[in-house]
């Protein structure tokens, strides 16, 4: 005997109480595939949470974040508070990066400088609490005996002043 | 940091009603809906609704529709729930939470019982 | 109405056991499944967001996984502090609901 629910389109349910009848999805549910006994409820975007994509008949809600907070989580499951470029979020609201640090983003953590010399280079550029520093060609590259036609502007590293 | 700041406990006669209050602060009181969730002695976690601080907008459990009131003062960053017709079932630690998706913080809760 | 079932409703464990508590959903939440520990006389406190997201400050090691309507939280070494009742909730959509809750508690 040839099971009816699966000539039931996405968009619809097989109702079993109406022998078997393709009904379409109540308001605020859906079904994706073909053949569902059952329509899902409809993802809610509420609160924190602004409607990306509305719910139709056959695909869910989609949410994302209000302005000023951004997603965190699988399919924006929580919203977090954004901060300002060279900030982060801690417990206790958004705080300035610490000397050495920085985040040129409005969301994750301050991160450390680049350490030039680690790679053998000089800092080109200082950082700041926006941006990582610059690293420049290495301090043998800047010795009077290495060939350049035009030679880099001496570097030097953040916090120390000029020789 | 965030915190939410619940009133103290209440003895209430069955009838009656209580209304508990959740004093946010540490972050923007307009951007996170408030739920109430209500947990009687040694029971589970039970959810009552939500309420919107920006635009005062509701959602209520079916089981408490018509006897529960979700409201707010934004000028001094609260919540309000308030539970009407009280029974003897109703005693249970209620609290609020602020919703991020999830309910990332929690008042400390405020005992309700309710006694002739 | 989403419910929520959990499992086991207790468990009995010792300290350093790796602990496993199911979630099932009565239908697709996605990753809408939240976890969260309660201790006596406390408010209950996020450990998982979104199935598997670690909340800020939970150790690393609890656990989330899952996708759909079924759901797992570990604990991969059980320490003397967590003994509790550990609450799956989805926040899929309204009205939110909570699993029964299992409560871990000493051997």
């Known amino acids: 005997l040839q099971d009816l629910c699966s000539n039931c389109p996405a968009g619809t349910f097989c109702d079993n109480n109406r022998s078997q009848i393709c009904s379409p999805c109540p308001p605020n549910s859906f079904s994706s595939a073909g053949g569902q006994r059952t329509c899902d409820i409809c993802r809610q975007c509420k609160g924190v949470f602004k409607t990306r994509k509305e719910c139709s008949s056959t695909s869910n809600a989609e949410c994302d974040c209000i302005s000023g907070y951004h997603c965190l989580g699988a399919e924006c499951s929580m919203c977090e508070q954004d901060c300002k470029q060279g900030q982060e979020l801690t417990k206790k609201g958004c705080k300035d990066c610490c000397f050495g640090t920085f985040n040129d983003q409005k969301r994750g953590i301050c991160r450390p400088w680049t350490n030039c010399s680690l790679d053998g280079k000089s800092v080109l550029v200082n950082g700041t609490k926006e941006r990582d520093v610059v690293c420049g060609p290495s301090p043998a590259d800047l010795s009077p005996g290495a060939s350049s036609a035009t030679p880099p502007a001496p570097a030097r590293e953040p916090g120390h002043s000029p020789q | 940091q965030v915190q939410l700041v619940q009133s103290g406990a209440e003895v209430k006669k069955p009838g009656a009603s209580v209304k508990v209050s959740c004093k946010a602060s540490g972050y923007t009181f307009t951007s996170y809906d408030i739920n109430w969730v209500r947990q009687a002695t040694g029971q589970g976690l039970e959810w009552m609704g939500w309420m919107n601080p920006n635009s005062g907008n509701t959602g209520y459990a079916q089981k408490f529709q018509g006897r529960v009131t979700m409201t707010r003062n934004t000028s001094i960053s609260t919540a309000y729930m308030e539970l009407s017709s009280l029974r003897s079932e109703d005693t249970a630690v209620y609290y609020c939470?602020?919703?991020?998706?999830?309910?990332?913080?929690w008042g400390q809760g405020t005992l309700v019982t309710v006694s002739s | 109405d989403i419910q929520m079932t959990q499992s086991p409703s207790s468990l009995s464990a010792s300290v350093g056991d790796r602990v496993t508590i199911t979630c099932r959903a009565s239908q697709r939440i996605n990753n809408y499944l939240n976890w969260y520990q309660q201790k006596p006389g406390k408010a209950p406190k996020l450990l998982i967001y979104?199935?598997?997201s670690l909340q800020s400050g939970v150790p690393s090691r609890f656990s989330g996984s899952g996708s759909g309507t079924d759901f797992t939280l570990t604990i991969s070494s059980l320490q003397p502090e967590d003994f509790a009742t550990y609450y799956c909730q989805q926040s899929y959509s309204t009205p939110f609901t909570f699993g029964p809750g299992t409560k871990v508690d000493i051997k």
């Open positions: 979104g199935a598997s």
């Open positions: 939470a602020r919703e991020t998706g999830p309910f990332d913080y």
